[in-house]
Amino acid sequence: MAVTACQGLGFVVSLIGIAGIIAATCMDQWSTQDLYNNPVTAVFNYQGLWRSCVRESSGFTECRGYFTLLGLPAMLQAVRALMIVGIVLGAIGLLVSIFALKCIRIGSMEDSAKANMTLTSGIMFIVSGLCAIAGVSVFANMLVTNFWMSTANMYTGMGGMVQTVQTRYTFGAALFVGWVAGGLTLIGGVMMCIACRGLAPEETNYKAVSYHASGHSVAYKPGGFKASTGFGSNTKNKKIYDGGARTEDEVQSYPSKHDYV
């Protein structure tokens, strides 16, 4: 019951997390800026991974997409890639985990198969969450290191002056959504991995073998000393010693599947 609850909760938490990662990726407010040097009206600028928007106190708002791929900063491309990889992995993980849920019966799927699928989806959720956290953190670092209160001046060779506008760059809502969503996906993935341990039947394939010596003349077959692990060719515990050695399969009339050492 606890395993089912852990698995179900892991699935729900991951689902919420991935929905958050998708929302953060689509949001425009990754970076927000107040443009100080405008004497006319308060201008608020906010930018996402896909477009940039300008909003004025008059109510005017305009957004423009980054329609080029090659000209954009490498950091932006890297963040985009990380977020998309996170979404794709998360989506695949969700698909796999639906079939892995213990509460859902699909044909005669064994617990071992469900355990493997749960582990796979858990790992996918963990990687997905890490991708999202990494993407958001890279972007946040880009804002902190490159853009915080830029006030430097420079001059063009054409004779016209260029100044960087004094702007205060702040973290947009998308960054916080991304961090939380990535964390949730990560937690969900860990829960799925924990649930996997409970789902996997810890079967030991070693079977007990009792030896009954029938006198002093025990004739061994040459090369007959072989260890049976339960995973090799000797899984049926064939008689490997002549003489009085008998396997439990021969002693018992109805051998049980759960003959543990």
């Epitope: 443009l35 405008n38 004025e56």
Partner: nanobody, 122 residues
Framework: QVQLVESGGGLVQPGGSLRLSCAAS????????MGWYRQAPGKGLELVAV???????NYADSVKGRFTISRDNSKNTLYLQMNSLRAEDTAVYYC????????????????WGQGTLVTVSS
């Protein structure tokens, strides 16, 4: 690189009119506010008029009612219609624009033009 090129300046009699234009070209992503500034001989830079992307305008008290600022966002062009010109309007008029570049849409720059001379004299 981005260029702001002013045109339309020249010699005009007092009470006359002139229309200045400023065309922005280059790898521009988005232009926000655009404005006209002027520098009279031996004086500092003075704001004439500024207009936002949304069309909100602001004028210096000395030109209110006489000058009209406008812009065409699709052409990245700024205009200044100057009527009832006076001798004190004689100056080099500079165009400026707050914009970001296609290569760096996260950073805002203020670009300035070379200036166009307006002389009001009889």
């Amino acid at each position: 690189q981005v260029q702001l090129v002013e045109s339309g300046g020249g010699l005009v009699q007092p009470g006359g009119s002139l229309r200045l234009s400023c065309a922005a070209s280059g790898s521009i992503f988005l232009i926000n506010a655009m404005g006209w500034y002027r520098q009279a001989p031996g004086k500092g830079l003075e704001l004439v008029a500024v207009i936002t992307r949304g069309g909100s305008a602001n004028y210096a008290d000395s030109v209110k009612g006489r000058f009209t600022i406008s812009r065409d966002n699709s052409k990245n062009t700024l205009y200044l219609q100057m009527n009832s010109l006076r001798a004190e309007d004689t100056a080099v008029y500079y165009c400026n624009a707050d914009l970001n570049l296609r290569s760096d849409p996260f950073k805002w720059y203020t670009f300035w033009g070379q200036g166009t001379l307006v002389t009001v004299s009889s």
